[in-house]
Amino acid sequence: AEDTGVDTGAPYWTRPERMDKKLLAVPAANTVRFRCPAAGNPTPSISWLKNGREFRGEHRIGGIKLRHQQWSLVMESVVPSDRGNYTCVVENKFGSIRQTYTLDVLERSPHRPILQAGLPANQTAVLGSDVEFHCKVYSDAQPHIQWLKHVEVNGSKVGPDGTPYVTVLKTAGANTTDKELEVLSLHNVTFEDAGEYTCLAGNSIGFSHHSAWLVVLPAEEELVEADEAGSV
């Protein structure tokens, strides 16, 4: 490991928000990747343990891929014997940090994503306030989540062929975590924000979706002004 002599120090996690999913349950035959992105000076080394013991490629059929630049461990076509605790150990001469992930390999039937009942919930908000819609997704395989808003085009909610007009507000991307996708935040809402919102979750089996409505009310000052203007 190289020591630049500048800001020497113990290892630290560079993307801790990407490491919050400590329990990973995946169907058999899928690919699993554990990541422990870190930094330090000198640049730390990374090693992996399975159930507290050194983990090497020869320990599993199909081997493993250690991608040191990406601080990752990849296992393809996982089987039930891959279940266990996987620990990354990141260290340099100034210190050591570690993170443990638990892998469960599922053999049950994979299904369409299941969305928690009642979410997202209908919301009523005052003009200028902030709103959050929540969507909880259960899926055997990694789901991809999108938030859609139903819109009108020339006064119509659907196209000539019956296709609903929608705008994609939020979608899975390289810099979006699962937790972030489960929440749609609307700030300083306007009357144009009122309408139907849909949480759409898909996996390799198919899609599922739940919708909710946002009603936007005038601010209280506007209500008062309207009352005064209407009084005789």
């Epitope: 169907p27 035959a29 899928n30 690919t31 076509s77 039937s109 994979p110 299904h111 369409r112 299941i114 969305l115 009942a117 395989a141 990694q142 991809h144 999108q146 859609l148 019956g162 296709t163 609903p164 929608v166 994609v168 979608t171 759409l200 898909g202 996996n203 390799s204 089996i205 198919g206 899609f207 599922s208 979706h209 739940h210």
Partner: antibody
Framework: EVQLVESGGGVVQPGRSLRLSCAAS????????MHWVRQAPGKGLEWVAV????????YYADSVKGRFTISRDNSKNTLYLQMNSLRAEDTAVYYC?????????????????WGQGTMVTVSS | DIVMTQTPLSLSVTPGQPASISCTSS???????????VYWYVQKSGQPPQLLIY???NRFSGVPDRFSGSGSRTDFTLKISRVEAEDVGVYYC?????????FGGGTKVEIK
């Protein structure tokens, strides 16, 4: 035109291997899950396997688990089915079919597009 | 696995007359999102299956309106209001809610 074209079928002896290909065109292949479905002569349809749009998730029918491997090369717009330890009961027409897309689409989320099929005969 | 059972095995229909095919699933196909994930296909001689109906009752694009799908949870029906000569083929139901995806055994529709 949206199209799927299977190839690689043929006559093979029991215990041998064969690799089927399915070339996709007319749509963004890398945004869709893909399936293999087979049909034995004079019989009904049997689902074989599915692979997610990025290849990270794969599921198989119990009848082929451990013998068949589904894979894809998104740079070549091609789906594959590697069939090992073939048995007489694997004799069938093998179809590839488009599965669920990666994002919002109106209409069915899969099995709207099928290839013409490729025949695999396992016989000694 | 979910078992899909189709009846009848075959059907001989006079042109212009209605036809009805039943399909029963061993488990409910009503999903948490309120949709029922049963699909219907027709397979004409020497061709791959063609999608007719998706999510219980939605006609796929280009499918004539004489085809309709209905049912709930575990019992499903495909109806052809007035059978035409071109409707000859084998009809299959399929559950699309979980893997392994499973098909009914098929119903052969013939013209009298």
């Amino acid at each position: 035109e949206v199209q799927l074209v299977e190839s690689g079928g043929g006559v093979v002896q029991p215990g041998r291997s064969l690799r089927l290909s399915c070339a996709a065109s007319g749509f963004t292949f890398s945004s869709y899950a893909m399936h293999w479905v087979r049909q034995a002569p004079g019989k009904g349809l049997e689902w074989v396997a599915v692979i997610s749009y990025d290849g990270s998730n794969k599921y198989y029918a119990d009848s082929v688990k451990g013998r068949f491997t589904i894979s894809r090369d998104n740079s070549k717009n091609t789906l594959y089915l590697q069939m090992n330890s073939l048995r007489a009961e694997d004799t069938a027409v093998y179809y590839c079919a488009r599965g669920a897309g990666r994002g919002y689409t109106y209409g069915p989320d899969g099995f709207d597009i099928w290839g013409q099929g490729t025949m695999v005969t396992v016989s000694s | 696995d979910i078992v899909m059972t189709q009846t009848p095995l075959s059907l001989s229909v006079t042109p212009g007359q209605p036809a009805s095919i039943s399909c029963t699933s061993s488990r409910s196909l009503l999903h948490s999102d309120g949709k029922t994930y049963v699909y219907w296909y027709v397979q004409k001689s020497g061709q791959p299956p063609q999608l007719l109906i998706y999510e219980l009752s939605n006609r796929f694009s280009g499918v004539p309106d004489r085809f309709s799908g209905s049912g709930s949870r575990t019992d499903f029906t495909l109806k052809i209001s007035r059978v035409e000569a071109e409707d000859v083929g084998v009809y299959y139901c399929m559950q699309y809610i979980e893997a392994p995806l499973t098909f009914g055994g098929g119903t052969k529709v013939e013209i009298k």
